[in-house]
């Protein structure tokens, strides 16, 4: 006998990075049906919703009116039908932006490069901060972590065309405040390669959705284009 | 120490051809790409192309593209470029560059001279 | 492609004076700005990296600012041996560019 219900799915609408003072919208997915859903911040209850009619619902959000920094961290939800409960969510980590300070992006040698040239980005913020992150627009998972007191090395090795785009980085006060965005540096990679199998190129979205292009790979679904990113999710645990 | 070593002087004919060649030296080759610039006599410098040995992508200048090389062979850390088609306004001296960033590192130089 | 002017093509300083060289790109490059000392029968020397960035080996005296389109390449004061031809390189895309250099030559 089935003693829990399947989990919810749990994202952030538009984006799980949230400006500071800018408006978000927590959603939880369950089962038609479902009577109650809770939403749980950093393990402790924060809200319930009870959707009416249930048996026409299977989806509730919780909105933010206003992110700040308290409002950062992990989110999780659980839904109830009858006296069952769900499973809890996967943990939806809500990340406040824009906060102090603007890093600065490079990348060397240059913007443009020739295929299988070693690339290394470099992200430089004044404040202190220690951690950094590296995101690249596009459909697919380009989130890459970074140490250093005031600036963090993000080596990309050899390139291929598949590394083309977009890229900016923040400086993170903690796991779930991070700083402006960096401007945007797009990396070319030029070259005719012979007897060489390269990456095909990730699609990208324009550059003013590039907040929106993370997917989860949970579901290989996209909702709304504002599923939260598995990938970039588990890099802040 | 870092070092590039470039072939000799040559003196050719217009229409023929010339390969000039770079061994490098006190570094990985196969973790810089290597550039050409070329410099006629009493002239500024002017990039040709440059190769990326480990996988040997290329990029050209448009100006030559068609009628230069860019080569590398990583047994022998040598880069080579080849230049067709020669003309009297293709005398200068080549240079090959490690690009790392800048060109950090430059060979010596070779004459082209191209006279009928 | 980026065009990169320099100017002036010939400036005369007096040694022990500075000396200010200018390259202007004709779109922005950042900071990915280079510049190169060349002196006759030699191969060019890197001098300064990334608009600003001091190179090993390089007397304290070069060094260079700008961002974006304009740059400078200063010489705080001038030794004898600095007097030859200084170039710029656009470092940001290709075709990878040169000014026309700037010869500097004693007054």
């Known amino acids: 006998q089935q003693q829990t219900l399947p989990k919810p799915f749990i994202w952030a609408e538009p984006h799980f990075m949230v400006p500071k003072e800018k408006q978000v919208t927590i959603c939880c997915q369950g089962n038609y049906g479902a009577v109650e859903y809770q939403l749980h911040f950093e393990g402790s209850l924060f809200a319930v919703d009870r959707p009416k009619p249930p048996e026409r619902i299977n989806k509730v959000q919780f909105y933010i009116p206003d992110m700040n920094s308290r409002m950062a961290g992990q989110y999780s939800c659980i839904y109830r039908v009858g006296e069952l409960w769900s499973e809890p969510s996967n943990l939806l980590d809500l990340v406040v932006t824009e906060m102090y300070d603007t890093p600065t992006l490079s990348v060397h040698p240059g913007p443009e490069v020739i295929s299988g040239e070693k690339v290394t980005f470099y992200c430089r913020l004044d404040t202190a901060t220690s951690m950094f992150l590296l995101l690249k627009e596009g459909r697919s998972s380009h989130v890459q972590r970074g140490y250093g007191k005031v600036q963090a090395e993000f080596p990309l090795g050899p390139v291929t065309t598949a590394h083309r785009g977009t890229y900016r980085c923040f400086g993170s006060y903690n796991n779930h405040a991070w700083s402006f965005p960096s401007e945007p540096v797009k990396l070319l990679v030029t070259g005719d390669i012979e007897n060489t199998s390269l990456a095909p190129e990730d699609p990208t979205f324009p550059a003013d959705t590039w907040g929106t292009y993370l997917l989860t790979t949970e579901t290989g679904l996209q909702k709304d284009h504002a599923l939260w990113d598995h990938t970039a999710q588990n890099l802040l645990r | 120490q870092v070092q590039l070593v470039q072939s000799g002087a040559e003196v050719k004919k217009p229409g023929s051809s010339v390969k000039v060649s770079c061994k490098a030296s006190g570094y990985t080759f196969s973790e810089y790409t290597m550039h050409w610039v070329r410099q006629a006599p009493g002239q500024g410098l002017e990039w040709m192309g440059g190769i990326s040995p480990n996988i040997g992508g290329t990029s050209y200048n448009q100006k030559f593209k068609g009628r230069v090389t860019i080569t590398a062979d990583k047994s022998t850390s040598t880069a080579y470029m080849e230049l067709s088609s020669l003309r009297s306004e293709d005398t200068a001296v080549y240079y090959c560059?490690?690009?790392?960033?800048?060109?950090?590192?430059w060979g010596q130089g070779t004459t082209v001279t191209v006279s009928s | 492609e980026i065009v990169m002017t320099q100017s002036p093509a010939t400036l005369s300083v007096s040694p022990g004076e500075r000396a200010t060289l200018s390259c202007r790109a004709s779109q922005s490059i950042s900071d990915y700005l280079h510049w190169y000392q060349q002196k006759p029968g030699q191969a060019p020397r890197l001098l300064i990296k990334y608009a600003s960035q001091s190179i090993s080996g390089i007397p304290a005296r070069f060094s260079g600012s700008g961002s974006g389109t304009d740059f400078t390449l200063t010489i705080s004061s001038l030794e004898p041996e600095d007097f030859a031809v200084y170039y710029c390189?656009?470092?940001?895309?290709?075709?990878?560019?040169f000014g026309q250099g700037t010869k500097l030559e004693i007054k």
């Open positions: 560059a490690r690009r790392g960033g800048s060109f950090d590192y």
């Open positions: 390189q656009n470092g940001h895309s290709f075709p990878l560019t």
